[in-house]
């Protein structure tokens, strides 16, 4: 970037730069035409006959430098060629020579400084690449000239550029004064503000462009060249924050557009917000839930929203006593999440009808929750007693959900309490075609027992056929109709108003072989 | 402000030749070109040559090839044009000049003349 | 040689009339063209060189415009100091025979 400090294509009034020394075939303000065909302010000189030695000097105003270390001047010039000129003298020139005076102010006059190199500051004497020539019986020709040249370094508050004809016949065109500075530049949103090199190169500190934040590792910078570029190298810049992305070249942040969200700062961009969930305003780092959806504090920000699960379907019971197996299907929606459990709540209610949560003596196999099969076996069922089951299904976001859980109830029934088994069978009396049998009453937990089912067959004899059954109201019982000498199996078992209890253990007995042994009382 | 001054007005006899002057005050003189025109009794303009004192050697237009001569002195900032083996149709005002710009001071060779002198009559009789 | 030609040779025109000249070269001159005006008993005056370019000093209802061979020059609103003969030149052809258009003299209606 360049910025001016004089340009004489842009001053409309005259110049009134100073000449030295006051004679004739000085320097001489003149209107031009330049390229765009627009009226300039020129200086011409053309003392092509002059004494040797003899100068003619052309000073500018006091320019500021504002901070500039090196300037560089711009001449566009016209020359004639000596050999174009007939009256040209040995002394004609085809150059001039540029230089420069530092001062604090505007302090030169017409005499002062003395005008000769040192004080001023020889820059360069220039040559004429292009000469303006004319042949006889042709019309005149010629090209402008342009040669930039480089001032510094520089110290003081402003400087005066002087030009020294020894004998040429030019034109100076335009002056272009200006110092080279390094453009504002964001790069990888990193701003670099506009820096005027001091030095051959600068380092220049830079800052995060709005909506970003510092990269991780060492503060972005780069180097300001003399030259007014910046020093090609990479820079651990800047990344746009949550809720913003990389826009225009990597030159600015630009938020997040509704529906879409960014959760971390650094690359990547906006993405559409995940399902169930929105973001109403620009600049989103989070997209918020539909109402009945949730993240759980698991999730990643940038997770879809999940809802609980709908309830188990079609819980089966299968009841065995006092234990009871339940299995169910999984819920018809699982709420879009992969962490689905089961929980059970229980009551119970006993015979009379008073209901209450289940008590401690039930067991849950394997668990009353977090079960993650569909089944579960409970134990230490109470006889008849009404269980009510209530199957739900739970996810990582039922806790944050507000509102019933959705359940599938079951209710099971256990039976009344039958008598227990019958054991303590005494044979009391034997002979050889009949027991006589007796037991202890069992203690039958509801209600008096009315009846005893005997079950008896001969031993080695196992078919259904061979099983006879003999009912009886007292606690025992005449076996008749056996076979001599024989081995009998036999099992009892009683029954009350809640049905038959089960067969006792099989208990041993054998008839006799005759009649003269007799009755006999024989223990069990 | 650049003035030209010609010289005054002549009377002339066929076959014979005029010289007109014409000087320059003010500033730079050399490196303008100074053209000359007539302009005959209720005719139009004529262009006859032109020349740029620094150079020495003039341009001239067909019609007057051979019969007319510019040149100009850069120590006096003068400029001539004489005309030879004059006829009756010569009878007209001359004029010299100057261009717009200098041919130091313009990217193109304008010869467009912004600067003109009074005129000089001259007269072609027998 | 090349010929300009203006027309038309001349043209009655009032106070405030927008008044256009033209002027064709025989051959093409880019944008080397002058207008000038003249003054019965006066040096001729440059209005317009480069085809568009308004000489310092003279008023902004005078323009010019055109290029190759086809040239124009418009007086916006011709005011009483207007009357005149207007010469178009080309600068471009070296020697520059037959500079000057034969004029169009502008008159009061």
């Known amino acids: 970037l360049e910025e001016t400090l004089l340009n004489t294509k842009l001053e409309t009034a005259d110049l009134k730069w100073v000449t030295f020394p006051q004679v004739d075939g000085q320097w001489e303000e003149l209107s031009g035409l330049d390229e765009e065909q627009h009226s300039v302010r020129t200086y011409e000189v053309c003392d092509v006959q002059r004494a040797p030695g003899q100068a003619h000097w052309l000073r500018t105003g006091w320019v500021p430098r504002r901070g500039a270390v090196h300037v560089y001047a711009t001449l566009r010039f016209t020359m004639l060629e000596c050999l174009s000129l007939p009256r040209a003298g040995r002394s004609c020139k085809e150059t001039f020579t540029v230089f420069y005076y530092e001062s604090d102010a505007d302090t030169a006059t017409a005499l002062t400084p003395a005008w000769m190199e040192n004080p001023y500051i020889k820059v360069d004497t220039v040559a004429a690449e292009h000469l303006t020539r004319k042949r006889p019986g042709a019309e005149a020709t010629g090209k402008v000239n342009v040669k930039t040249l480089r001032l510094g370094p520089l110290s003081k508050a402003g400087f005066y550029l002087a030009f020294q004809d020894q004998g040429a016949c030019m034109a100076l065109l335009s002056l272009h004064l200006f110092y080279k500075k390094c453009a504002q530049l964001t790069v990888n949103l990193t701003r670099f503000p506009e820096t005027v090199p001091r030095e051959l190169v600068v380092p220049v500190a830079g800052s995060c462009v709005v909506d970003a934040v510092p990269a991780p590792g060492p503060s972005p910078s780069l180097y300001c060249r003399e030259d007014g570029q910046w020093a090609e190298q990479p820079v651990t810049g800047c990344s746009c924050a949550p809720g913003f992305e990389a826009a225009e070249g990597n030159t600015k942040c630009r938020a997040c557009a509704q529906g879409t969200f960014k959760p971390l700062s650094g690359e990547g961009s906006c993405q559409p917000c995940p399902a169930n969930s929105h973001s109403n305003t620009i600049g989103s780092a989070v997209c918020q839930c539909r109402v009945g959806y949730f993240r759980a504090r698991t999730d990643p920000r940038g997770a879809p929203c999940t809802t609980p699960p709908s309830a188990p379907r079609s819980v089966v019971s299968r009841l065995n006593g006092s234990s009871l197996h339940l299995e169910w299907s999984a819920p018809l929606e699982s709420g879009g999440r992969e962490d689905l459990t089961y929980a059970l709540r229980c009551r119970e209610c006993r015979p009379g009808g008073s209901c209450a949560p289940c008590g401690g003596d039930l067991t849950f196999d394997p668990g009353p929750r977090d079960l993650v099969e569909p089944w579960v076996v409970v134990r230490g069922l109470r006889p008849d007693f009404t269980y009510t089951f209530e199957v739900t299904a739970l996810n990582g976001v039922s806790s944050l959900a507000t509102g019933p859980v959705p359940f599938e109830p079951v209710n099971v029934t256990t039976d009344r309490e039958v008598p227990p088994a019958v054991s303590d069978i005494r044979v009391t009396r034997s002979s050889p075609s009949s027991l006589s049998l007796a037991w202890a009453v069992p203690r039958a937990p509801s209600g008096a027992v009315l009846d005893y089912e005997v079950k008896y067959h001969e031993k080695g004899a196992e078919g259904p056929s061979s099983v006879r059954f003999l009912k009886t109201s007292e606690n025992r019982a005449e076996l008749r109709g056996l076979k001599r000498g024989a081995s009998y199996l036999v099992q009892v078992r009683a029954r009350s108003e809640a049905g038959y209890g089960p067969f006792g253990q099989e208990h041993h007995s054998q008839t006799q072989l005759d009649e003269s042994e007799g009755w006999r009382e024989q223990l069990a | 402000q650049v003035q030209l001054v010609q010289s005054g007005a002549e009377v002339k006899k066929p076959g014979s030749s005029v010289k007109v002057s014409c000087k320059a005050s003010?500033?730079?003189?050399?490196?303008?070109?100074i053209s000359w025109v007539r302009q005959a009794p209720g005719q139009g303009l004529e262009w006859m040559g032109k020349?740029?004192?620094?150079?020495?050697?003039?341009d001239y237009a067909q019609k007057f090839q051979g019969r007319v001569t510019i040149t100009a002195d850069e120590s006096t900032s003068t400029a001539y044009m004489e005309l030879s083996s004059l006829r009756s149709e010569d009878t007209a005002v001359y004029y010299c000049?100057?261009?717009?710009?200098?041919?130091?001071?313009?990217?193109?060779?304008?010869?467009?003349?912004?600067?003109w002198g009074q005129g000089t009559l001259v007269t072609v009789s027998s | 040689d090349i010929q300009m030609t203006q027309s038309p040779s001349s043209l009655s025109a009032s106070v405030g009339d927008r008044v256009t000249i033209t002027c064709r070269a025989s051959?093409?001159?880019?944008?080397?063209l002058n207008w000038y005006q003249q003054k019965p008993g006066k040096a001729p005056k440059l209005l317009i060189y480069?085809?568009?370019i308004l000489q310092s000093g003279v008023p902004s209802r005078f323009s010019g415009s055109g290029s190759g061979t086809d040239f124009t020059l418009t007086i916006s609103s011709l005011q009483p100091e207007d009357f005149a003969t207007y010469y178009c030149?080309?600068?471009?052809?070296?020697?520059?025979?037959?500079?000057f258009g034969q004029g169009t003299k502008v008159e009061i209606k």
């Open positions: 000049a100057r261009s717009s710009y200098t041919i130091l001071t313009t990217y193109y060779n304008y010869n467009a003349m912004d600067n």
């Open positions: 003010g500033g730079t003189f050399s490196t303008y070109a």
């Open positions: 020349i740029i004192p620094i150079f020495g050697d003039a």
């Open positions: 051959q093409n001159i880019n944008n080397f």
């Open positions: 480069g085809s568009s």
């Open positions: 030149s080309q600068d471009h052809f070296y020697p520059p025979s037959g500079t």
